[in-house]
């Protein structure tokens, strides 16, 4: 018994005069805007996006929207076309949804915010945006009160008219419409494809948060990793950083390239490498390989407990007004607009701390 290193877990609620607001990362579930896909993009990435077959032809499809099909048929006419160099990172950057077009309104603690307050970040969903990233020398925003008026409220247009037609199942095309959101500490990168939650158009979604500070013990009392990150890519250790680090190594090892969202200096995967290696390899790692990416718990971490609720938007009463305000049809408003409210429930944080049972 003397050699048993027991621990106890202490729970505490700590009142605070202010709390650091978390980073909020959001991604449109559609990775590439239809209007931004050029003839050269289609030539290089058409098969990856299931828009072309392996003979550079539009596949036989009864599912196509006539207008979209007409545009694609014109772009897919490669007679006398000379392909230009193509880079997946540049494609994601140029063709991904632009926060300046999506963001219809933004308020933090009642004050107006704008697209400039969102930093571009690449994830497996492509071009995404983080509010309050705390990077580029910007201070981390604070909040002094709990409740909806003291957090972030944004209205977004998800731009479904720009969604790529889905004529096949690929990792780069989505059956869903909306955004994915992750609320996370500024000390860890987003891992939104695995840890994000979905927000649907046609709803105002309220996310009530509670900050939780977790303190774990290292061996032999617990299993946390007390060492600083052994990584070329991240400054501080987190499970997310470790997993991204590991996924990058796995892809470079299997495919000799990295996905657009992965750090490092390996070459970016080509569309062919995405299709033939990177997508299936990463799917295998995430779904099947239980051993390659074993990431230890850090000794200190901040997470955010969340409670979600939703109401319909627009109401019958406001549909006409919003349609006029944004110069869109009522149907467009119903299919594309969402409001997201993220706030602290109360101005306190919870500590969950492992302590040695006896010294």
């Amino acid at each position: 018994y003397y050699f048993c290193y027991h621990h106890v877990t202490k729970l505490d609620e700590v009142a605070a005069s202010q709390l650091t607001f978390p980073a909020v990362t959001l991604c449109n579930l559609n990775e590439f805007r239809f209007s931004q896909v050029s003839k050269n993009d289609l030539y290089h990435a058409g098969e990856l996006l299931a828009l072309l077959n392996n003979r550079y032809e539009i596949p036989d499809t009864q599912m196509a929207d006539e207008k979209q099909l007409e545009i694609l048929q014109d772009k897919a006419n490669f007679r006398s076309f000379k392909p230009k160099p193509f880079n997946m990172r540049e494609f994601y950057d140029r063709a991904g949804h632009d926060i300046r077009d999506m963001l219809l309104s933004c308020h933090f603690r009642g004050e107006a915010c704008s697209a400039e307050d969102f930093k571009v970040v690449f994830t497996r969903y492509g071009k995404c945006y983080t509010f309050n990233s705390g990077q580029d020398g910007r201070p981390r925003l604070k909040t002094m009160k709990g409740g909806t008026g003291n957090g972030l409220e944004i209205m977004l247009d998800i731009q479904q008219d720009e969604y790529l037609p889905v004529w096949g199942e690929t990792d780069e095309t989505s059956f869903e419409a909306g955004i994915k959101v992750q609320i996370h500490s500024q000390d860890e990168p987003p891992f939104i494809d695995q840890l994000g939650f979905g927000v649907a158009p046609g709803f105002q979604t309220f996310v009530s948060c509670q900050e939780q500070r977790l303190i774990y013990l290292p061996s032999p009392w617990g299993t946390c990793n007390a060492v600083t990150m052994d990584s070329d890519f991240f400054d501080s250790y987190s499970i997310t950083a470790c997993r991204i680090d590991c996924e990058t190594r796995y892809l470079v090892e299997n495919c000799n390239c990295r996905m657009v969202h992965m750090p490092g200096d390996a070459p970016y995967c080509t569309p062919e490498q995405y299709k033939e290696c990177a997508d299936p390899a990463l799917d295998f790692l995430v779904e099947k390989d239980q051993e390659y990416c074993v990431c230890e718990m850090p000794c200190n971490l901040t997470r955010y407990g969340k409670e979600l609720s939703m109401v319909k938007i627009p109401s019958k009463a406001s549909a006409k007004y919003l349609a006029k305000k944004f110069n869109k049809s009522e149907q467009y408003i119903g299919e594309n607009i969402l409001v997201l409210d993220i706030f602290f429930e109360v101005l306190n944080y919870e500590t969950i701390e492992q302590k040695k049972a006896y010294e």
Epitope: L285, K288, Y292
Partner: antibody, heavy 116, light 107 residues
């Protein structure tokens, strides 16, 4: 180039033992799970056993459980299959394969014949 | 264990024919299915992985489709070199299992 080279097959009497080896090259051996697959003469493919990259987890087909032991030496980039209490129905070509999002490559196979 | 049922077990066809081989899993295996071609005395050759991905160097007349429990391998226009035995394999979960094989022979 990623390569697997299976060896150690031969003729053995029923009840006897044999140890197969599979030498790997061209990839980080310890990062990948590995499997043995066999094929009896004129028959189909049968998965025999698998092992995780570290060697911590092992898996067996019911037909060989308790008789065969899979192991690996990551310092030597080698996979092993220790076969005990061999039976006539274990006669087959044994292939080693690298497990991942695709099972590629396979070794060329080593023939095990169990006969008196 | 997951059972893989392949059909037909024998298939007679002529050069230029379009042929389809099906594989049914006893429970969902997502897309973790591979197709192999094997010729007598040789190791299996990977054709398709993750249900629909064509292995590098494999002619484009081979294609795979399906997910969940139903999968197909299609050869769009049979060539003389394609007469062989074909196997499907699930690698979704241990114990990994193969179909019983489809022997493709000249009509």
């Amino acid at each position: 180039e990623v390569q697997l080279l299976a060896s150690g097959g031969g003729l053995v009497q029923p009840g006897g033992s044999l140890r197969l080896s599979c030498a790997a090259s061209g990839f980080t051996f310890s990062s990948f799970a590995m499997s043995w697959v066999r094929q009896a003469p004129g028959k189909g493919l049968e998965w025999v056993s698998g092992i995780s990259g570290s060697g911590v987890s092992t898996y067996y087909a019911d037909s060989v459980k308790g008789r065969f032991t899979i192991s690996r030496d990551n310092s030597k980039n080698t996979l092993y299959l220790q076969m005990n209490s061999l039976r006539a129905e274990d006669t087959a070509a044994y292939y080693c394969a690298k497990e991942a999002y695709k099972w590629q490559p396979w070794g060329q196979g080593t023939l095990v014949t169990v006969s008196s | 264990d997951i059972q893989m049922t392949q059909s037909p077990s024998t298939l007679s066809a002529s050069v230029g024919d379009r042929v389809t081989i099906t594989c049914r899993a006893s429970q969902s295996i997502s897309s973790w299915l591979a197709w192999y071609q094997q010729k007598p005395g040789k190791a299996p050759k990977l054709l398709i992985y993750k249900a629909s991905n064509l292995e590098s160097g494999v002619p484009s007349r081979f294609s795979g489709s399906g997910s969940g429990t139903e999968f197909t391998l299609t050869i769009s226009s049979l060539q003389p070199d394609d007469f062989a035995t074909y196997y499907c394999q699930q690698y979704n979960s241990y114990s990994y299992t193969f179909g019983q094989g489809t022997k493709l022979e000249i009509k």
